[in-house]
């Protein structure tokens, strides 16, 4: 998490700031949602525990042509220590159900808010 620059400021961003900015982006997506997010695309749900940021990116990166989540994809890549490409699923990513992107974003947002309140920024 030492290389989270480029989202809002030129230098490295403290983890708390990066997490807050990610939460703000997800709030923005959910509040500005008029039509179904990403036209109802479905993605693999994830286990919101260890390795969550990489798992979230692995799931969302498969959705292309959805400008609403492009910034989220970029921001998540800053939290994931390894490069993620479409079609890549780590062992942490159990493929048991698919949900709409809108639900995925809501679930992720609720969990990140909880982490932020608890001071878990990494």
């Amino acid at each position: 998490l030492t290389c989270l620059g480029g989202f809002a400021s030129p230098g490295p961003v403290p983890p708390s700031t990066a997490l807050r900015e990610l939460i703000e982006e997800l709030v923005n997506i959910t509040q500005n949602q008029k039509a179904p997010l990403c036209n109802g695309s479905m993605v693999w749900s994830i286990n919101l525990t260890a390795g969550m940021y990489c798992a979230a990116l692995e799931s969302l990166i498969n959705v292309s042509g959805c400008s609403a989540i492009e910034k989220t994809q970029r921001m998540l890549s800053g939290f994931c220590p390894h490069k993620v490409s479409a079609g890549q699923f780590s062992s942490l990513h159990v493929r048991d159900t698919k949900i709409e992107v809108a639900q995925f974003v809501k679930d992720l947002l609720l969990h990140l808010k909880k982490l932020f309140r608890e001071g878990q920024f990494n």
Epitope: P36, N39, S41, M42, V63, S64, R95
Partner: nanobody, 116 residues
Framework: EVHLLESGGGLVQPGGSLRLSCAAS????????MDWVRQAPGKGLEWVST????????YYADSVKGRFTISRDNSKNTLYLQMNSLRAEDTAIYYC?????????WGPGTLVTVSS
Amino acid sequence: EVHLLESGGGLVQPGGSLRLSCAASGFTFDSAEMDWVRQAPGKGLEWVSTISPSRRGTYYADSVKGRFTISRDNSKNTLYLQMNSLRAEDTAIYYCAKAYTGRSYWGPGTLVTVSS
């Protein structure tokens, strides 16, 4: 352009079987992950099943596990869903989808009604 057309739906009694087909064109079918998704009357979308491009990976919603089987014939650009032991709660419009694409790329769907 992605084009998908489902067929095989109809009226069936509880405990009966149906086989849905989906003819695909406009994209490289054999390298695409494919989904079946359904929408029951007055309900939201529900993911049913996914098959990987290589046919090695098949995944099912808990509600259909052990009853439904997804398969594909890459030589025919066709996706299938074999549905056995059908229940009233399986009544829905079934859509074939190229994974990770929005509804504008889905087919029109095929209606499955399970009723006695």
